[in-house]
């Protein structure tokens, strides 16, 4: 049935981009719970994939960040790029691979007392991320910003979260991106467990709200680690520092 293909209580998935940008391997993803492969979704063709476009880091996988692919490139074109490894140059935390953060322009290993061991699960999902682009370009304005005299409400089409009213983020829904509510404590959230997996989503959830991060629900015991339920949970006291 359709519900077994697109379960509304989890991110609904599409095949990954073929031959896309860094972080998006051209081959089909290997079998994993909740992920469909080329030919696995009857509502989409797979003959015209492109590098995954983005407006902010939350739209990219845990191993990626959002930026213009070329330093002198078109400011209006941003895609998800592979994260930067330890000792590589950076401008913000999201550019660094999980387990690292940006310090003095260099990706360095996260100190366990500074960031929790679960940083790889939360680095792109804390509220208040720095959404600046790699080179500080201003983003292209289109009809969406011209048409809005006020910030977008729930269900409004958006290009980025700044188009949306407070408490909302810009996330994919079907073939558009719309303003959806930022997640509250206890609500189910989505983990990007596999590189590039964000590109599979056609029904994105927002990130967790301020002071919350997306973690495995403590009392949710299942046989498979990858199918554990994640919910928005309060940070512990030593986890108040925002990563971005």
């Amino acid at each position: 049935t359709l519900n077994s293909v697109l379960n509304s209580n989890a991110i609904k998935n599409l095949p990954p981009p073929l031959g896309g940008a860094a972080g998006h391997p051209g081959s089909a993803v290997s079998a994993a719970p909740g992920i469909l492969y080329p030919g696995g979704n009857k509502y989409q063709t797979i003959d015209n994939y492109q590098p995954y476009p983005c407006a902010e880091d939350e739209e990219c996988g845990t191993d990626e960040y959002c930026a213009s692919p070329t330093r002198g490139g078109d400011a209006g074109v941003q895609i998800c790029l592979a994260c930067r490894k330890r000792r590589k140059r950076c401008m913000r935390h999201a550019m660094c691979c999980p387990g690292n953060y940006c310090k003095n322009g260099i990706c360095v290993s996260s100190d366990q007392n500074h960031f929790r061991g679960e940083i790889e699960e939360t680095i792109t999902e804390s509220f208040g991320n720095d959404h600046s682009t790699l080179d500080g370009y201003s983003r292209r304005t289109t009809l969406s910003s011209k048409m809005y005299h006020t910030k977008g409400q729930e269900g409004s089409v958006c290009l980025r979260s700044s188009d949306c009213a407070s408490g909302l983020c810009c996330a994919r829904h079907f073939w558009s991106k719309i303003c959806k509510p930022v997640l509250k404590e206890g609500q189910v959230c989505t983990k990007h467990r596999r590189k590039g997996s964000h590109g599979l989503e056609i029904f994105q959830r927002c990130y967790c709200g301020e002071g919350l991060s997306c973690r495995i629900q403590k009392d949710h015991h299942q046989a498979s680690n990858s199918s554990r339920l994640h919910t928005c949970q309060r940070h512990h006291h030593h986890h108040h520092h925002h990563h971005h």
Epitope: Y43, Q44, N48, S144, G155, H173, W175, S176
Partner: antibody, heavy 117, light 111 residues
Amino acid sequence: EVQLVESGGGLVQPGGSLRLSCAASGFTFSSYAISWVRQAPGKGLEWVASVSGWGDTYYPDSVKGRFTISRDNAKNSLYLQMNSLRAEDTAVYYCATSLKNYAFDYWGQGTTVTVSS
Amino acid sequence: EIVLTQSPATLSLSPGERATLSCRASESVDDFGISFMNWYQQKPGQAPRLLIYAASKQGSGIPARFSGSGSGTDFTLTISSLEPEDFAVYYCQQSKEVPPTFGGGTKVEIK
């Protein structure tokens, strides 16, 4: 002013092909999703195909493999290539877009496709 | 796919009267804190026009006499006081899941 103008409809025999066009104006075409929705005579509405602003395409089972949606952002145009047409494809075909919200908030006036021998 | 059932099929009313149209979904169309239910009006020979989206939000330029309510599986479109131009067919449509589906329509005719 947002405008969507369909063309290309007509009479075609079963098994034949037809290409519909939708000319868009009044908005930044390349940034937005756009779809085809059809309505058989005296019947309700049925979603036919959609293409996102980033170029992915989507179809229901009823047309998958027979219809192809495409867009030419340079020409602000949307297309629907219809092959292996059947009598049940007879309908008014509308292009519709989602500019302000996720629903189909702007529609063209429609173009009529008749599949008959 | 989600099936939408509209009732009644035909509603015979006079100008000035209140119209209440119903749409029932085969499963909940709520997700992400939003009810993904929309309502359209269609007059003979014309394209549909969006009236309501997200169950209760008005489309652009829609008169205040049109309002939507409901959540989950049961939704209502209300026209507080029918104007002559309101006699038309009304469709509900869900955007929670692919494929997006439409109800069979309710025809509001002059009594």
